[in-house]
């Protein structure tokens, strides 16, 4: 037999808005209080097993207590009611969950999408949390006929039961509800047929076309409804490396098509593209992305022919010369295919003319001391690259006309190189450079830029600490004028070694130190100073600064018959090093001098 | 390496005609004159005839014109002489000879690489 409880709590079921004030009574049974020797005044109130402090209980009367509580911000309470049971032994009388929250917010954005396939899907905004168990009901009906309700799972959308009927415009709304309250959103009436989200489009192909080579096909199959919806395109393209899509212009897609030509494409480059779709008229949803594709542009004939040079061997006696013709294979960007040779034509001055077909980056020639013009082009298999015309000069003409105020720098991790343009009109610059080494020939790489450059930085791999010498040729229709060098580094650093001193000549009170310049390959960058410094074992340490373009130096007042000990640095602009330390000692007599 | 291989020397009477036949083998490069040259003892080396092997152009010494013609089978790597009319003076060593220099003066013996070992030719009255 269930034991009846000795009073009751109301309300039982307590919802409090949060922040408001709340009272509840405890009301003890009359055979309660006779069993027990109590009254009002004998109940302890509690929340969460802390009693509630007196001030906030009032003994209404004989069976009543009431306890008020302000402000109430805890989302749940055990709220219990307890007597002091003969005065002293505490029992609980009854126990109530206090839950507090808000009523509901009126919801608003509330929005319908029909993803093409499923039923209709509509989102809400609930507004702030009510910290409350809230039902959320989506309604729905037409004017002459409700649909069934949605009943919300999660309490910001609803999947309708029913297939939406399109061509016939609907009302739906959203009513939120809850202890606190009841409200219900604006209504939204709009025919589901505008509220579409179609399927991708499917079976994206690209397809290139041999008559040019800056155009690609693609064909798709759109689904909208299964032909039941006219849709519009929306194209992204971008190239196989790049990260950001390029887009059609949306004006060019409006109308309902399966294919479209994109056009102002590279030649000979893949492109990747993706595609969605929306009903014609703008409304509804678009599509999600379809599977990317791509393809690739057709070949082109090289849009330029490539950078041209030429080196010449000693010549074999007086007779002829070997020329070494060289020239850099084409960025993809210009070669526009893959080339297949090279065709190099050598025009003797007499029109003596000989073809050669190259497939490599060079052709080593022998010609007579007479002038020649030699012409390059680069041939895919499309056809053939402008060509690119160099004029090979007799050995017995000298070159005029350098470049001027020629500098070179380092700044943004790049070498750069300047120059002022010689007064006479420039085809072209030629920029050699390699690397200074004791150890190693010079082994040059070279660029070519245009007539109207006179500033650019070396586009190889270059080494930091390491001295370049850059040589810059100004050619001209006629052949190369001449080649002015500099030395340069890309980042110094500070030597490798410093300078091995060595006395060259010592006497009473001076002594003349020599030293060897350091190989260029421990300078690490330009030799700016020398510093000597020399001291005796109890003297204090002097120090004299030499410029770097000495390699000897006379130390004056010294002692005689002493020993010094001597050692040089070399400093270049991030720094310097210590040479070995050398000593020596001053003669006690001068030379002829007697005791 | 490079080998150039004369043929078809001998003995004919004044007025007769020969036939030489060069082969070139092992050549990488891409000669541009093939020629003919012969050499009486005692005497320097001359230029007879000589063959462009990208056009086909030739020219020959003045002393043969018009009887001997140079030509080219290219498929095969050979050049022919083939000498008409030969007279007391044409005898002497016939060398074939290769040249990789881009030239008019197809004949000067200076611009010429690669030579064979010789064939003799022989006129007698």
């Known amino acids: 037999q269930l034991l009846e409880p000795c009073g009751y709590i109301y309300p039982e079921f307590p919802v409090v808005q949060r922040g408001s004030n709340f009272t509840a009574i405890c009301v003890l049974k009359e055979a309660c209080l006779q069993h027990y020797y109590v009254n009002a005044s004998y109940i302890v109130w509690k929340t969460n097993h802390a009693a509630v402090p007196r001030e906030q209980v009032t003994v209404i009367n004989r069976t009543t207590s009431s306890v008020t509580f302000t402000d109430v911000v805890l989302p749940s309470v055990q709220l219990t009611c307890n007597i002091l049971s003969f005065g002293q032994i505490e029992q609980n009388v009854y126990g109530v969950t206090m839950l507090s929250g808000f009523p509901p917010d009126k919801p608003t954005n509330l929005t319908c999408i029909v993803n093409e396939g499923k039923n209709m899907l509509c989102q809400w905004d609930p507004g702030r949390e009510t910290y409350l168990e809230t039902n959320y009901t989506l309604k729905s009906e037409w004017a002459t006929e409700k649909f069934p309700d949605c009943q919300s799972k999660h309490g910001t959308s609803c999947m309708v039961s029913y297939m939406p009927t399109y061509y016939v415009n609907i009302e739906v709304w959203v009513e939120a509800e809850n202890a606190l309250g009841k409200v219900s959103s604006e209504s939204i009436n709009f025919d589901p047929v505008d509220k579409v989200k179609p399927t991708p489009p499917y079976n994206l192909s690209v397809t290139n076309s041999e008559e040019l080579s800056s155009i690609l096909k693609l064909s798709w199959v759109s689904s909208g409804l299964g032909g039941l919806l006219d849709l519009k395109s929306d194209i992204q393209y971008r190239t196989k490396d790049a990260s950001t899509w390029i887009q059609v212009p949306l004006e060019d897609t409006m109308s309902p098509r399966t294919s479209f030509t994109v056009q102002d494409l590279k030649p000979f480059t893949e492109y990747v593209f993706r595609i969605r779709s929306i009903k014609d008229s703008g409304k509804g949803y678009w599509s999600d992305w379809s599977e990317e594709a791509s393809g690739t542009t057709y070949e082109d004939r090289p849009s330029r022919p490539p950078s041209f040079w030429y080196k010449t061997n000693p010549s074999h006696g007086q007779e002829y010369r070997s020329v070494r013709l060289i020239w850099k294979a084409l960025p993809l960007s210009e070669a526009n295919g893959k080339i297949l040779d090279y065709e190099v034509i050598l025009t003797q001055s007499k029109s003596v003319s000989q073809t050669y077909t190259v497939t490599g980056t060079e052709l080593t020639v022998n010609l007579t001391n007479d002038r020649y013009v030699a012409s390059l082009a680069a041939r895919n298999k499309v056809g053939k690259s402008a060509a690119a015309v160099l004029t090979i000069p007799s050995p017995h003409v000298t070159a005029a006309y350098s470049v001027v105020n020629l500098k070179a720098f380092p700044k943004d991790n790049l070498l750069w190189v300047e120059w002022t343009p010689p007064p006479k009109p420039v085809s072209k610059y030629i920029l050699e450079w390699c690397v200074l080494s004791e150890n190693a020939p010079c082994v040059e790489d070279w660029q070519q830029e245009d007539a109207t450059v006179n500033r650019t930085h070396l586009r190889g791999r270059l080494l930091e600490s390491k001295c370049y010498q850059i040589t810059v040729t100004p050619v001209f229709a006629t052949g190369p004028g001449g080649s002015e060098s500099l030395k340069a580094y890309l980042k110094q650093a500070a030597p490798a070694r410093g300078p091995t001193v060595r006395t060259k000549k010592v006497g009473k009170n001076e002594a003349v130190l020599a030293w060897d310049q350091i190989p260029v390959d421990d300078q690490n960058g330009f030799i700016r100073n020398y510093s000597i410094s020399y001291r005796t074992s109890v003297g204090k340490e002097m120090v004299v600064h030499v410029d770097s373009s000495h390699t000897e130096y006379t130390l004056s007042s010294l002692s005689s018959d002493t020993l010094y000990m001597v050692r040089m640095a070399a400093y270049t602009d991030e720094g310097g090093k210590d040479g070995p330390e050398f000593t020596f000692t001053t003669p006690k007599f001068a030379q002829g001098e007697i005791e | 390496q490079v080998q150039l291989q004369e043929s078809g020397g001998g003995s004919v009477q004044a007025g007769g005609s020969l036939r030489l036949s060069c082969v070139i083998s092992g050549f990488t490069y891409r000669q541009t004159f093939m020629g003919w040259f012969r050499q009486v003892v005692g005497k320097e080396r001359e230029g007879v005839a000589a063959?462009?092997?990208?056009?086909?152009?030739?020219i020959y010494a003045d002393s043969v014109k018009g009887r001997f013609t140079i030509s080219q089978d290219s498929s095969k790597d050979t050049v022919y002489l083939e000498m008409n009319g030969l007279k007391l003076e044409d005898t002497g060593m016939y060398y074939c000879a290769a040249s990789t220099v881009i030239t008019s003066e197809s004949i000067n013996r200076n611009l010429y690489q690669y030579w064979g070992q010789g064939t003799q030719v022989t006129v007698s009255s």
């Open positions: 063959i462009s092997t990208g056009g086909g152009s030739t």
